[in-house]
């Protein structure tokens, strides 16, 4: 609704917040959440499982402002940082620093972005410049990806980059088409 106050070239109108889901209450800066893929069923043999769906991934909620040159978003956005190793769901610690990460012997499972959302942000600029609006790509969920020795270095490097920091915006994408999507679990005001 705050958009109405600006003489912008595009105006976004969001219905009353009560009508639509808000971000879950834990979406504050640097909170963590453990999330098990496929319902988090614990493996029958936790140290021998080879099914990626049996592994859980640590998601760090991160709140930041979007910047574009001297302009900054009017409101912070919340996205996920996919963090650390993946391990059997029931062996993962509930918080950073509590216990040690379980490392599978053999293939390496990495926590990487799975799904994104395109969120529109209003950018306020200094010096009387008119506000602008754009969409940014934000990480919405993470997954465990099995890496083997056959993965090349560039792929490993990309995973490391994705896991280490939040997405600033839009990154180069492979050319394949997306599969049919599932409903978003994370949604901000925009």
């Amino acid at each position: 609704q705050g958009w109405q106050a600006f003489k912008n070239d595009a105006t976004e109108i969001i219905p009353e917040l009560g009508e639509y889901p808000e971000p879950p209450p834990e979406l504050e800066n640097n909170k963590t959440m453990n999330r098990a893929e496929n319902g988090g069923r614990p493996p029958h043999h936790p140290f021998e499982t080879k099914d990626v769906s049996e592994y859980s991934c640590r998601e760090l909620h991160f709140t930041r402002y979007v910047t574009d040159g001297p302009c900054r978003s009017a409101k912070p956005v919340t996205e996920l940082v996919c963090s650390g190793q993946c391990g059997p769901a029931r062996l993962l610690p509930n918080a950073i620093g509590r216990g040690k990460w379980w490392r599978p012997s053999g293939p390496d499972f990495r926590c990487i972005p799975d799904r994104y959302r395109a969120q529109r942000v209003q950018l306020l600029c200094p010096g009387g410049e008119a506000p602008r609006a754009r969409k940014v790509r934000l990480v919405a969920s993470c997954k465990c990806k099995r890496l083997t020795r056959f993965h090349n270095q560039s792929e490993l490097k990309d995973f490391g980059t994705e896991a280490a920091r939040p997405q600033k915006g839009r990154k180069p994408r492979p050319r394949a088409r997306s599969a049919k999507a599932n409903q978003a679990e994370l949604e901000n005001a925009y």
């Epitope: 912008n8 395109a118 180069p172 997306s178 599932n182």
Partner: antibody, heavy 125, light 111 residues
């Protein structure tokens, strides 16, 4: 298969309004923004605005603010655009086109990758 | 608004040769390392069809004779080798900033 099926042509009188529809199928409706684009006869394309079916948020090109109203019906996976106070300048073909809201990393999320066939609107007395 | 200027407005190319269409933006459409320029093809009586997204990425199902490049404010669409069915209209479109805007179009003719 992704499909956007738009309603049929409209012949309307000046000063009235018209409401056209765009029924989506073949994908999860709430995972994509629905954009609306105007193409006047023999001319280029103009982005009218978009609506996010997930949360109902709408964004309008300032040029079309007050002229167009975007809505959705999630239960039928249908997007609607109403045009008000019609004049001859509103005679055009109007397209709906999706862009991605919730997606994996392998899509052209910042482009309109599927389009409806268009709804022709003729404003004449 | 970001203004996109396409040139030429019309272009005639011999069958099998290369067609190059230019699109210049009134300000940069780059953000965080990516360029937010898309290219569409429109045949008469049909809706536009996405060819290239993010300046250089070929959309799924589009023939490899279509390619795009550029960054900042200057972008090009290349078609090589040109085929008869390519004789239609092409539009560039920026998605870097609201409102999304389109170029004026380039009509390609084959001789």
């Amino acid at each position: 298969e992704v499909q956007l099926q738009q309603s049929g042509p409209e012949l309307v009188k000046p000063g009235t309004s018209v409401k056209m529809s765009c029924k989506a199928s073949g994908y999860t409706f709430t995972d994509c923004y629905m954009n609306w684009v105007k193409q006047s006869h023999g001319k280029s394309l103009e982005w009218i605005g978009d609506i996010n079916p997930f949360n109902g948020g709408t964004t309008y090109n300032q040029k079309f603010k007050g002229k167009a109203t975007l809505t959705v019906d999630k239960s039928s996976s249908t997007a609607y655009m109403q045009l008000n106070s019609l004049t001859s300048d509103d005679s055009a073909v109007y397209y709906c086109a999706r862009s991605h809201y919730y997606f994996d990393g392998r899509v052209p999320w910042d482009a309109m990758d599927y389009w409806g066939q268009g709804t022709s609107v003729t404003v004449s007395s | 608004d970001i203004v996109l200027t396409q040139s030429p407005a019309s272009l005639t190319v011999s069958l099998g040769l290369r067609a190059t269409i230019s699109c210049k933006a009134s300000q940069s459409v780059d953000y965080d390392g990516d360029s937010y320029m898309n290219w569409y093809q429109q045949k008469p009586g049909q809706p536009p069809k996405l060819l290239i997204y993010a300046a250089s990425n070929l959309e799924s199902g589009i023939p490899a004779r279509f390619s795009g490049n550029g960054s900042g404010t200057d972008f090009t669409l290349n078609i090589h080798p040109v085929e008869e069915e390519d004789a239609v209209t092409y539009y560039c479109q920026q998605s870097n900033e609201d409102p999304w805007t389109f170029g004026g179009g380039t009509k390609l003719e084959i001789k």
